[in-house]
């Protein structure tokens, strides 16, 4: 396993609809054709997998149908979107990138993006 640099923003604020987007960029050390991207959430020293996708260079990023993540790839950067977020989902979201093929295998883990989610206030009842 060889190490690889990964960069991502330090902080992102989710929209009022519970959607957060951020870029994950990696320093590809060679001609990788198969890349796996995983989003991990760290909160209270617990790390859980949020979503993962494997893609071939030049093709779209495909997450499972029931995934809360969507994304697009362009060169050695991935634009990730996580939806359905609630205030309780606030935490550090870490981008993990693996160059699966061809060998050698490379692994890179970003420092994480702190995503803040604020639940919207319910609208007050209107007299109209």
């Amino acid at each position: 396993c060889k190490a690889m640099h990964v960069a991502q923003p330090a902080v992102v604020l989710a929209s009022s609809r519970g959607i957060a987007s951020f870029v994950c960029e990696y320093a590809s050390p060679g001609k990788a054709t198969e890349v796996r991207v995983t989003v991990l959430r760290q909160a209270d020293s617990q790390v859980t997998e949020v979503c993962a996708a494997t893609y071939m260079m030049g093709n779209e990023l495909t997450f499972l149908d029931d995934s809360i993540c969507t994304g697009t790839s362009s060169g050695n950067q991935v634009n990730l979107t996580i939806q359905g977020l609630r205030a309780m989902d606030t935490g550090l979201y870490i981008c993990k990138v693996e160059l699966m093929y061809p060998p050698p295998y490379y692994l890179g883990i970003g420092n994480g993006t702190q995503i803040y989610v604020i639940d919207p206030e319910p609208c007050p009842d209107s007299d109209f």
Partner: nanobody
């Protein structure tokens, strides 16, 4: 859209040095990571080095580490490749390529670059 033009190639004796330049027009190069590649006749394109947008991150494959140095001057919209201790096997057409990125990293994979220069010929011979 950014356009790239390489210069600085030519004929050099073994053991000599050259500095290649990659000048950009049409856009500011500071928004782009830049890589240098070369292709010798009948061979695949080979990665040589890359540099991130700010210049703080660079990368080299083992084959040229210690002999080649990449740098950039964003004020001049130019990236440079300093090549020392040149050998006959360094003879090739040298290309620079650019990729618009958000952060400071760069890639050594030719697959990641979407804008390429026309190349400059480097010949190492006595």
């Amino acid at each position: 859209e950014v356009q790239l033009v390489e210069s600085g190639g030519g004929l050099v004796q073994p053991g000599g040095s050259l500095r290649l330049s990659c000048a950009a027009s049409g856009d500011t190069l500071e928004s782009f990571a830049v890589g240098w590649f070369r292709q010798a006749p009948g061979k695949e394109r080979e990665e040589l080095s890359c540099i991130g947008r700010t210049g703080e991150f660079t990368d080299y494959p083992g084959s040229v580490k210690g002999r080649f140095t990449i740098s950039r001057d964003n004020a001049k919209n130019t990236v440079y490749l300093q090549m020392n201790s040149l050998r006959a096997e360094d003879t090739a057409v040298y290309y620079c390529a650019a990729e618009r990125l958000v952060f400071h990293l760069c890639s050594l994979s030719e697959y990641d670059y979407d804008t390429w220069g026309q190349g400059t010929q480097v010949t190492v011979s006595s």
